[in-house]
Interface confidence: low
């Protein structure tokens, strides 16, 4: 029904090819294949995509042709299973090919790797990139899709098409500029940072659907869309939520052609019904498709209607609360969430979901009580501590951020989180704590009314990175517990963790603290990561070290790097001064 009501098609592959057009069809199939077979060479994927495209064209010409009636999963799965080196490259993933659909696709999905063993993407010289772009634009852009998709197997495919369009525009403009590097590099940096953020946000949506189910995702979507479209009727929001859930379920499930097609339909619907959705959509709806969909996804919150009545009337004071709840629990809770969220653009989505959960729990208990109204009359009082907890946490952390600056704020979080969960791998702790620390620059600049939605919803995205990386190789029961018990309480769960008293400190290994002259040629960011890696290792060796002790060692370390990078014989300096630094640090920390 609705946006996605379609006639039955004899050939699904022909239908999607016609809907999406050849260029988007090929790009999406490439993304799909690269997200499944993350280790396969680029050339192999291009060959598979070309074969699928040629086959799709035969089905467009004659939908009754042989195999054209097969499902996309069957066609794509059969194609992936023709890869000769599947067993050698992917090990047990090759066993997926012995299964029938839909089990085969589920098997491929389970083998997606959030942290694939792939080399870091090194950016070539600008002239080299521009030459490659001009020599073969199509291959150059396909390579971009391939490299991003295989490193980010849950990247939102239609959004990756938008990134590729911007990537192409950057090269088209900058490769003919007088100063190519000055034009291109900032644009590529922006695309890289936005791309990482987009990937992480989508990863949370997929985790929400896959680990906590459709109901959890729909609740998130009701809250977010109600904040964004407070003038829209509940039924309109519900319809958008249903359609959005279908889109993300498809993309998270590897059904990228259906996902992109349905996302385009949803954007069309939203723009055709702007009047009953939001006054902020006009500019978005004038853009071409990819830009339009992106713009709608990022659109600012509409103004709240001026005359919204008190929530208490319908959800506390009314004698029909239990009757309405019993008649259709999820609809009634959805209405509560909608009404609360549209009134509170200043709350994070996860806070709104905690409030809805508290309301649900209260009704479950009270509607079975002797006097239900008396029982739930004070339910809104229970919200106060739930609201104050993130408010206070954000206030304290923004004060700390303003006092320390981003790098030192990250270091404070590195120490805090290493003490909480010291079993987690050092690279993961560094990556996650650096990202947690970015909340300061991202959100503390905002006025009070925008801080909480910015900060807490961003922290949910970052903590999900920790959860998916930890799931691959679980090492900490505390992380598993916080990640799996409740999606909306992940952040409070991690915040509540104290120092892990059961942790046995790591043996001291001088090699971990041996540095070489190559550190001097690193970018400032890479150098910070080296220092932060050392800091995590220090805490793992000495979890009871005080802030002052750690600060002294880190200051000595910074001075040591600075001194040796200025020395004539850098390598000798690092060898000799490094030994002294290790000895001094051991003494300072009592190792």
């Amino acid at each position: 029904r609705g946006v996605f009501r379609r006639d039955a098609h004899k050939s699904e592959v022909a239908h999607r090819f016609k809907d999406l057009g050849e260029e988007n069809f090929k790009a999406l199939v490439l993304i799909a294949f690269a997200q499944y077979l993350q280790q396969c060479p680029f050339e192999d994927h291009v060959k598979l995509v070309n074969e699928v495209t040629e086959f799709a064209k035969t089905c467009v010409a004659d939908e009754s042709a042989e195999n054209c009636d097969k499902s996309l999963h069957t066609l794509f799965g059969d194609k992936l299973c023709t890869v000769a080196t599947l067993r050698e490259t992917y090990g047990e993933m090759a066993d997926c090919c012995a299964k029938q659909e839909p089990e085969r696709n589920e098997c491929f999905l389970q083998h997606k790797d959030d942290n694939p063993n792939l080399p870091r993407l090194v950016r070539p010289e600008v002239d080299v990139m521009c030459t490659a772009f001009h020599d073969n634009e199509e291959t150059f852009l396909k390579k971009y899709l391939y490299e991003i998709a295989r490193r980010h197997p849950y990247f939102y495919a239609p959004e990756l098409l938008f990134f590729a369009k911007r990537y192409k525009a950057a090269f088209t403009e900058c490769c003919q500029a007088a100063d190519k590097a000055a034009c291109l590099l900032p644009k590529l940096d922006e695309l890289r940072d936005e791309g990482k953020a987009s990937s992480a946000k989508q990863r949370l949506k997929c985790a929400s659907l896959q680990k906590f189910g459709e109901r959890a995702f729909k609740a998130w979507a009701v809250a977010r869309l109600s904040q964004r479209f407070p003038k829209a009727e509940f039924a309109e929001v519900s319809k958008l939520v249903t359609d959005l859930t279908k889109v993300h379920t498809e993309c998270c499930h590897g059904d990228l052609l259906e996902c992109a097609d349905d996302r385009a339909d949803l954007a069309k619907y939203i723009c055709e019904n702007q009047d009953s959705i939001s006054s902020k959509l006009k500019e978005c709806c004038e853009k071409p498709l990819l830009e339009k969909s992106h713009c709608i996804a990022e659109v600012e919150n509409d103004e709240m209607p001026a005359d919204l009545p008190s929530l208490a009337a319908d959800f506390v004071e009314s004698k029909d609360v239990c009757k309405n709840y019993a008649e259709a629990k999820d609809v009634f809770l959805g209405m509560f969430l909608y009404e609360y969220a549209r009134r509170h653009p200043d709350y994070s989505v996860v806070l709104l979901l905690r409030l809805a959960k508290t309301y649900e729990t209260t009704l479950e208990k009270c509607c079975a009580a002797a006097d239900p109204h008396e029982c739930y009359a004070k339910v809104f009082d229970e919200f106060k501590p739930l609201v104050e907890e993130p408010q206070n946490l954000i206030k304290q952390n923004c004060e700390l951020f303003e006092q320390l600056g981003e790098y030192k704020f990250q270091n404070a979080l590195l120490v805090r989180y290493t003490k909480k969960v010291p079993q987690v791998s050092t690279p993961t702790l560094v990556e996650v704590s650096r990202n947690l620390g970015k909340v300061g620059s991202k959100c503390c600049k905002h006025p009070e009314a925008k801080r909480m939605p910015c900060a807490e919803d961003y922290l949910s995205v970052v903590l999900n990175q920790l959860c998916v990386l930890h799931e691959k190789t679980p090492v900490s029961d505390r992380v598993t517990k916080c990640c799996t018990e409740s999606l909306v309480n992940r952040r409070p769960c991690f915040s509540a963790l104290e120092v892990d008293e059961t942790y046995v400190p790591k043996e001291f290994n001088a090699e971990t603290f041996t540095f070489h002259a190559d550190i001097c040629t690193l970018s400032e960011k890479e150098r910070q990561i080296k220092k932060q890696t050392a800091l995590v290792e220090l805490v793992k060796h000495k979890p009871k070290a005080t802030k002052e002790q750690l600060k002294a060692v880190m200051d000595d370390f910074a001075a040591f790097v600075e001194k040796c990078c200025k020395a004539d014989d850098k390598e000798t300096c690092f060898a000799e001064e490094g030994k002294k630094l290790v000895a001094a640090s051991q003494a300072a920390l009592g190792l």
């Epitope: 029904r1 609705g2 946006v3 009501r5 829209a232 009727e233 509940f234 039924a235 309109e236 519900s238 319809k239 619907y269 055709e272 019904n273 009047d275 009953s276 309405n324 008649e327 259709a328 609809v331 009634f332 209405m335």
Partner: nanobody, 115 residues
Framework: QVQLVESGGGLVQPGGSLRLSCAAS????????MSWVRQAPGKGPEWVSA????????RYAESVKGRFTISRDNAKKTLYLQMNSLKPEDTAVYYC????????VGQGTQVTVSS
């Protein structure tokens, strides 16, 4: 399962009247605004009229203002559209929807205005 079943359509002469009904089930009818939408042969859906959940606020498309009246009975979970002074251009399949959506749920009811 949300269900909307429209009835009351038929063949009528220009200037005549019809009363359409829409029986709702599967959701808390009294909590939702509702609309009537129509689709003429070969054309896209056209929003006709809307009513808020309590029935106090009604809206109409310019083309039907003064001729059509939307109402509801929340106890019976039914939405109505009283159509007077019908014109040939009112010929279409009429269906009711939740909110201001133009998404079709029910099968609709055919209204034909012809002499």
């Amino acid at each position: 399962q949300v269900q909307l079943v429209e009835s009351g359509g038929g063949l009528v002469q220009p200037g005549g009247s019809l009363r359409l009904s829409c029986a709702a089930s599967g959701f808390t009818f009294g909590s939702f605004g509702m609309s009537w939408v129509r689709q003429a042969p070969g054309k896209g859906p056209e929003w006709v009229s809307a009513i808020d959940s309590g029935g106090g606020d009604t809206r109409y498309a310019e083309s039907v203002k003064g001729r059509f009246t939307i109402s509801r009975d929340n106890a019976k979970k039914t939405l109505y559209l009283q159509m007077n002074s019908l014109k040939p251009e009112d010929t279409a399949v009429y269906y009711c929807t939740i909110g201001r959506s133009t998404s079709r749920v029910g099968q609709g009811t055919q209204v034909t205005v012809s002499s």
